[in-house]
């Protein structure tokens, strides 16, 4: 199965938003200034993220406005931290066969989730919808992001991403274009596209689950239509 994720290159520039999606709704992961992490039904300045891809499928997720790294404690709680701890603030990224992405802690094995329950990631599992993420480009004007990215204490302050945290100077395209069948972006409420004017559009159905028991890999299901 081709890797459709935009996150697995050595670096993927620009701001993105991670969101969960079911047939009727979506929640964007946001990292607040106080470190609280939750979901919002729409893109916000706190859901604008930078995702740094590292070796072996690891990613580092940063909230641009909160200037906090997404981290996880030993109980599986996710939170935003100004300090980068490699054990708590790096996540293993995996694209499921249905085109959705999951992130789990290599240290504690829990999934990043917008739901309150803490669940360990098991290969081949079918996680609940609030633990499966899609990514969408940022649609919030850059003027709202007049703030530096947090310094990663284990790296040089002269790193490219430090000097141009929003990647406005040299924007990059997606490393691997998403195949239409599996990684197509959904319109958001803020889009002005024709699809957004009909956000429910009869675009596609909801989650297609090809295995009733939820133990094997899912098929490449159409993405949900949501509001």
């Amino acid at each position: 199965y081709p890797n459709a994720s935009p996150l697995l290159g050595s670096s993927w520039g620009g701001l993105i938003h991670l969101y969960t999606a079911t047939a009727r709704n979506s929640y964007h992961l946001q990292i607040h200034k106080n470190g609280h992490v939750d979901g919002a039904p729409h893109q916000t300045i706190y859901s604008a993220l930078m995702i740094r891809s590292e070796d072996a499928g690891f990613v580092v997720i940063t909230g641009v406005m909160s200037r906090r790294y997404l981290c996880m404690d030993f109980r599986g709680n996710i939170f935003g931290s100004h300090y980068f701890d490699p054990e708590n603030c790096r996540f293993q990224h995996q694209t499921l066969e249905n085109g959705y992405d999951v992130y789990h802690s290599p240290q504690y094995h829990f999934l990043v989730s917008l739901g309150r329950a803490k669940r360990a990631f098991l290969p081949g599992m079918n996680p609940p919808p609030y633990s499966q993420f899609l990514s969408r480009r940022n649609e919030i004007p850059l003027i709202h992001f007049n703030t530096p990215i947090p310094r990663r204490h284990t790296r040089s302050a002269e790193d490219d991403s430090e000097r141009d945290p929003l990647n406005v100077l040299k924007p990059r395209a997606r490393m691997t274009p998403a195949p239409a069948s599996c990684s197509q972006e959904l319109p958001s409420a803020e889009d002005n596209s024709p699809m957004a004017s009909d956000p429910l559009g009869v675009v596609r159905g909801g989650r297609v689950n090809t295995h009733a028991g939820g133990t094997g890999p899912e098929g490449c299901r159409p993405f949900a239509k949501f509001i």
Epitope: T22, N25, A117, R119, M125, P129, G206
Partner: antibody, heavy 117, light 106 residues
Framework: QVQLVQSGAEVKKPGASVKVSCKAS????????MHWVRQAPGQGLEWMGI????????SNAQKFQGRVTMTRDTSTSTVYMELSSLRSEDTAVYYC??????????WGQGTMVTVSS | AIQLTQSPSSLSASVGDRVTITCRAS??????LVWYQQKPGKAPKLLIY???SLESGVPSRFSGSGSGTDFTLTISSLQPEDFATYYC????????FGPGTKVDIK
């Protein structure tokens, strides 16, 4: 604390419309979708639709397409559900419920709508 | 659409009994299942989310289990205030409810 307070009971004639309100307090209104669920006398719970509080976009159960209109007023943190072309089988208690990603965690007290000629 | 079936549709039990209610989904829904309790004239009350997580403030005699298609709500020792109707709901695709299980006094 989170509260969802609904408008009072209504009696309507067949063919008329009814508009039920649900005022939210105790949380950031625009951070949670809101649902409408109804329950006919002696029957189970029936999901009607959902509204995005920031954009006002809605999605309704197929059964109610064309008859239900959900709106919101962010200035007063209130959502509304209007059901048109009422018939006797629409007699039910109508609830608003807050979406908490993994459950409907808070519910309004319910609004009884009676459709009778 | 995913259909939920609950069994039994009603049951009679005594205070102190162990009560088990099952909910079956027509296709796999992972752990995206919720249980509610409803008493006459009242709004539903959240008991269990994500199939097995107890909502804050809910007594520990309530527990949920299951994943995929088969789920269970268990009341370890039925109390007088537990006589009510219980509904399951799936959040995997849409927001469908099960038909409910009424627990009444034997």
């Amino acid at each position: 604390q989170v509260q969802l307070v609904q408008s009072g009971a209504e009696v309507k004639k067949p063919g008329a419309s009814v508009k039920v309100s649900c005022k939210a307090s105790g949380y950031t209104f625009t951070n949670h979708y809101m649902h409408w669920v109804r329950q006919a006398p002696g029957q189970g719970l029936e999901w009607m639709g959902i509204i995005n509080p920031i954009s006002g976009s809605t999605s309704n159960a197929q059964k109610f397409q064309g008859r239900v209109t959900m709106t919101r007023d962010t200035s007063t943190s209130t959502v509304y559900m209007e059901l048109s072309s009422l018939r006797s089988e629409d007699t039910a208690v109508y609830y608003c419920a807050r979406d908490a990603v993994d459950a409907f965690d808070f519910w309004g007290q319910g609004t009884m709508v009676t459709v009778s000629s | 659409a995913i259909q939920l079936t609950q069994s039994p549709s009603s049951l009679s039990a005594s205070v102190g009994d162990r009560v088990t209610i099952t909910c079956r989904a027509s296709q796999g829904i992972s752990s995206a299942l919720v249980w509610y309790q409803q008493k006459p004239g009242k709004a539903p009350k959240l008991l269990i989310y994500d199939a097995s997580s107890l909502e804050s403030g809910v007594p520990s005699r309530f527990s949920g289990s299951g994943s995929g298609t088969d789920f269970t709500l268990t009341i370890s020792s039925l109390q007088p205030e537990d006589f009510a109707t219980y509904y399951c709901q799936q959040l995997y695709d849409d927001f469908d409810f099960g038909p409910g299980t009424k627990v009444d006094i034997k």
